[in-house]
Amino acid sequence: DAHKSEVAHRFKDLGEENFKALVLIAFAQYLQQCPFEDHVKLVNEVTEFAKTCVADESAENCDKSLHTLFGDKLCTVATLRETYGEMADCCAKQEPERNECFLQHKDDNPNLPRLVRPEVDVMCTAFHDNEETFLKKYLYEIARRHPYFYAPELLFFAKRYKAAFTECCQAADKAACLLPKLDELRDEGKASSAKQRLKCASLQKFGERAFKAWAVARLSQRFPKAEFAEVSKLVTDLTKVHTECCHGDLLECADDRADLAKYICENQDSISSKLKECCEKPLLEKSHCIAEVENDEMPADLPSLAADFVESKDVCKNYAEAKDVFLGMFLYEYARRHPDYSVVLLLRLAKTYETTLEKCCAAADPHECYAKVFDEFKPLVEEPQNLIKQNCELFEQLGEYKFQNALLVRYTKKVPQVSTPTLVEVSRNLGKVGSKCCKHPEAKRMPCAEDYLSVVLNQLCVLHEKTPVSDRVTKCCTESLVNRRPCFSALEVDETYVPKEFNAETFTFHADICTLSEKERQIKKQTALVELVKHKPKATKEQLKAVMDDFAAFVEKCCKADDKETCFAEEGKKLVAASQAALGL
């Protein structure tokens, strides 16, 4: 439906509060280095303009597209070239190229200071002094650090952030109330950002078809009672929502997401029996709840898949008539029967089925050619099952920290060219699969583990894309979205790698390590471990373990010493010498 003024349409649909919040998120995701105050000023100007268009849709410039309006506004920033360099060249382009240019300059790892959490009294004071500014600042800080964060979901996080402060700043023990809530929001926020980053990568690097395939599989698992036509409609709508958000069209995205939630709730009887509670909630909670809703029960007595997809004489006819529809039906039918499979496995099976049909439908006897296609699935299913079994056993044996260390060593040997901070971050996240998924029963392990690993490996891919250093990473990241994890799993030690020169400074530690949190201390030790492997890629597990045990003892000893700094200096030299000897450096 065409509107005279798109900006007026979205302002009226979303309301002023959400409109302003979404414009702020959009601007902060594009211009990640701009100060908060500058963004607020731009947002206020856009909002005032939108109000004039609501009053009179025929007013000057009200007919312009949102990209034109927002792009023009962003291009008024005075320090664009000094701050962003070549991104300023985007402003010389016309829409839609200008917006594409801004999108290409989004930085997944912006050079921004770590967010330091102030004292609780200071945070509560800031919250009470100006609640609106405090919450805007939250949106701004998250959006600029996570330029692909799912904007309507960020509104939900902000609502929970506000609730945490409203409750805890009037609590007796404010810190005990607030800090766990903020930790939870931080951890959930990072996970949400990473999940959305994979959706955007899927759309942008592999296209709409890849995303739709993912959505068919996931929604069919979640809504196994829904008809194929219903799932297809949901997939189409969901693809539109995510295409918009990943493309920076946040107002349209939020509006369409609200419409989709409304549609799902109005039609829950034909979608899922699990939606009732979600649909009683307010909009932001409702949309979040639907996105996280548990899988519905599978319909009883589903017929065998073989009848329609192997045994039928019409397989090639049906495939030829509408390839994607037929493959979509295959994926739907397979996924609704297999909530125990990861989405990426289901997509691998569908790809195998497609490849077989492409080959066999051109053969002399198609039916005889594809008759055993389901047998080809067996090794594809067993590979992730075995991998998860082995890694969960290792996790249970080692615990999370040591399991992360095992993965650090494994991945550093596979791709030693990758920067140490990236290897540490990615391996730590890979290691979290243990505590996240290994506690689940067999039927839930694979969807939990492999789909989580897809999200984490995508972090590696987007960080590596910014500064490519390894052909092996590039290959695994770009060849096939669904085979990324098997591709990385299959990598062996990189024999072409020339070990890094030894630098004593890398292994010099100071008393400040003693005041770090347990998590930060682990990161320091894991950083040292990666560096060790980069120096000595052929070091055995036993050698590395011995050095790391000595290192842990050294830190513990010096942190107990009266003169910590002297201890770190003197004992540190001894440790470096001993480690070099142990590793034969």
Epitope: V120, D121, C124, T125, H128, Q170, A171
Partner: antibody, heavy 124, light 107 residues
């Protein structure tokens, strides 16, 4: 302006219960906690407990644990304090008071607005 | 529980006098101390929060100081309307506690 309006005086027999109400106006009710403080005739101030108006969570002084219940009705911006098993030494003026916001970097939980007080007399 | 001891329990002073009331905590309470004024038959009124911050609308002749365990409330020049009972209150830990009060009367 910010106001806390309490219910009227009560006379109760020992062993009975009393429920005092405190209606807030002039501010966002769920943004501020409410404390209850009592004052026996000619005596000092004694803290009874506190309610988080946002979550409904409560904290009571040990002395009143098991006898006091604080609740709130956000739809009418009202807090209630019910004290059961009344004894003669529960005779006092009961005040509700608003916990002030954190200001200038400190959450002093000062009681910045007080109700007018409700006299509860326990007598056989 | 944390005990607050006010001194003196009562004092007599004249209009224009400088008056100091002290409040000692049985353990450190940082700056989580507030001062109230109460007149007969009325509810208490907040004067000072966070040990030294003047509540808005309170005359500047009132001031507070201290941290840890020792705190003072000072009235620089007594006015007729200042004759009342003064209470300190700590909010560092639950249960919240009040001092026993200091009665300030006209000499």
């Amino acid at each position: 302006q910010v106001q806390l309006l309490q219910s009227g005086a009560e006379v109760k027999k020992p062993g009975a219960s009393v429920k005092v109400s405190c209606k807030a106006s002039g501010y966002t009710f769920t943004s501020y906690g409410i404390s209850w403080v009592r004052q026996a005739p000619g005596q000092g101030l004694e803290w009874v407990g506190w309610i988080n108006t946002y979550s409904g969570g409560t904290k009571y002084a040990q002395k009143f644990q098991g006898r006091v219940t604080m609740t709130r009705d956000t739809s009418i911006s009202t807090v209630y304090m019910e004290l059961s098993g009344l004894k003669s030494d529960d005779t006092a003026v009961y005040y509700c008071a608003r916990l002030g916001h954190c200001q200038r970097g400190i959450c002093s939980d000062a009681l910045d607005t007080w109700g007018q007080g409700t006299l509860v007399t326990v007598s056989s | 529980e944390l005990v607050l001891t006010q001194s003196p329990s009562s004092l007599s002073a004249s209009v224009g006098d400088r008056v100091t009331i002290t409040c000692r905590a049985s353990q450190s309470i940082s700056r989580y101390l507030n001062w109230y004024q109460q007149k007969p038959g009325k509810a208490p009124k907040l004067l000072i929060y966070g040990a030294s911050r003047l509540e808005s609308g309170v005359p500047s002749r009132f001031s507070g100081s201290g941290s840890g365990t020792d705190f003072t409330l000072t009235i620089s020049s007594l006015q007729p309307e200042d004759f009342a009972t003064y209470y300190c209150q700590q909010s560092d830990s639950v249960p919240v506690t009040f001092g026993q009060g200091t009665r300030l009367e006209i000499k």
